[in-house]
Amino acid sequence: EEELQVIQPDKSVLVAAGETATLRCTATSLIPVGPIQWFRGAGPGRELIYNQKEGHFPRVTTVSDLTKRNNMDFSIRIGNITPADAGTYYCVKFRKGSPDDVEFKSGAGTELSVRAKPSAPVVSGPAARATPQHTVSFTCESHGFSPRDITLKWFKNGNELSDFQTNVDPVGESVSYSIHSTAKVVLTREDVHSQVICEVAHVTLQGDPLRGTANLSETIRVPPTLEVTQQPVRAENQVNVTCQVRKFYPQRLQLTWLENGNVSRTETASTVTENKDGTYNWMSWLLVNVSAHRDDVKLTCQVEHDGQPAVSKSHDLKVSAHPKEQGSNTAAENTGSNERNIY
């Protein structure tokens, strides 16, 4: 017996295109006398969807028989929903008036969202590879979803990233929406096995988000470290020099040995060993015939990795008339050298 209230229990309803939407409404009293009408939108431009009193509404049916006594259920069904039906629907009680009925009380409204699933997120990385300590950008795109509310997260190896910017377009009302996000990722030497994941959560996905991935192996370049080492003498007149090429990625690598600036041998990395972090190691060796040299010998290991400018390490062999004990040493810098008497 309380004054009539118009109750729309559902704040929002999600319906897939082609389905039937049920919009619920009950009135708590029969008084004041007057019809219930349904509108899409509010204000002067609202669109009449159903009028209990009069009119023809082919897509609309009432859930219950409004001619039955004590029936105060004014819920309606709208068939064959399309994205154009999205909006807020109001169940409005009118009071009989002359000449026109007067709006008495409105329900709080039910937002009808015509749901459409987002497309699988596509993650793209930079066009060129980058080295550790550099920041690279990844983009993630997904399209065709509705309603507009959507959540996008970025992960690197399961750890959520925070440095990203996301836009959902268009800003205004639309049949469907697109999301575009750009994340910044700082590369480390350990990122060969890393993955960047873009995760999109949407009401249509029922708690099972869509994921797009990018492997950092496609993005990262880890330049090699070189170590040139003189091995113990194999014979009176031979020295074995090795060039350890460590921790590089990708595998594409060409090594050239130079003796006093002249190309001695060129080879392409083939039988590499893989480290746990996904980088590679490779070793090349050069057997130098010391007796063929009267003067000191400058040995250079020159590596061209993944099309980048060559890096090199050198090692000096000193040829001497006075034999001393043999040993080994390592060239520390490309420009510096370590001398060793060989006899």
């Epitope: 309380e2 004054e3 006398v33 019809p35």
Partner: antibody, heavy 114, light 111 residues
Framework: QVQLKESGPGLVAPSQSLSITCTVS????????IHWVRQPPGKGLEWLGV???????IYNSALMSRLNISKDNSKSQVFLKMNSLQTDDTAMYYC????????WGQGTLVTVSA | NIVLTQSPASLAVSLGQRATISCRAS??????????MHWNQQKPGQPPKLLIY???DLESGVPARFSGSGSRTDFTLTIDPVEADDAATYYC?????????FGGGTKLEIK
């Protein structure tokens, strides 16, 4: 329990204004509409108007220009104001609650006389 | 305004007999499947009391001796059997249209 109680001046001089207060208890004015009805001595009932929970009003068109109904939810009071009273406005004035006038006050007698 | 005409204006019925009161509306008081006609009882010095609402629904606490019927413009209140306590004036009332209106009343006497 639900109670409505009218309080008025009793006697009003012709052409003067009438103010009646309906004080309610046992329910909230934010949930129920209040109607005003009057009954001249020995005669029938006449509906004057209603104030809905939101504060909007409807008046009997025959009296609309002379009537004003208002309320103060926090004080649980509804007010009837009527101006330019004549002798034929002498009546018992009732306030009543809700859609079917289920609950009534005992009424307050207003006599319009010089 | 909808005018409600009650007949008879007064009625004397013997104890235990049936009393029938008629109410005719100047236009239909039916809307959306309901008849917005109600019946009230008023005893001297008291406010009206709701007996029947929506033409035929018995108000809680009202004896089943009271019943209502009718639709559109013609309505009837029946008291069967009449008891001494039923002596009162009975009013029909409509709220299908504004302003709400009452019938002129029917005074019931018990013989």
């Amino acid at each position: 329990q639900v109670q409505l109680k009218e309080s008025g001046p009793g006697l009003v001089a012709p052409s003067q204004s009438l103010s009646i207060t309906c004080t309610v208890s046992g329910f909230s004015l934010s949930s129920y509409a209040i109607h005003w009805v009057r009954q001249p001595p020995g005669k029938g009932l006449e509906w004057l108007g209603v104030i809905w929970t939101g504060g909007s009003t409807i008046y009997n068109s025959a009296l609309m220009s002379r009537l004003n109904i208002s309320k103060d939810n926090s004080k649980s009071q509804v007010f009837l104001k009527m101006n330019s009273l004549q002798t034929d406005d002498t009546a018992m004035y009732y306030c009543a609650r809700g859609n079917y006038l289920r609950y009534w006050g005992q009424g307050t007698l207003v006599t319009v006389s010089a | 305004n909808i005018v409600l005409t009650q007949s008879p204006a007064s009625l004397a019925v013997s104890l235990g007999q049936r009393a029938t009161i008629s109410c005719r509306a100047s236009e239909s008081v039916d809307s959306y499947g309901y008849s917005y006609m109600h019946w009230n009882q008023q005893k001297p010095g008291q406010p009206p009391k709701l007996l029947i609402y929506l033409a035929s629904d018995l108000e809680s606490g009202v004896p089943a001796r009271f019943s209502g019927s009718g639709s559109r413009t013609d309505f009837t209140l029946t008291i069967d059997p009449v008891e001494a306590d039923d002596a009162a004036t009975y009013y029909c009332q409509q709220n299908n249209d504004d302003p709400w209106t009452f019938g002129g009343g029917t005074k019931l006497e018990i013989k």
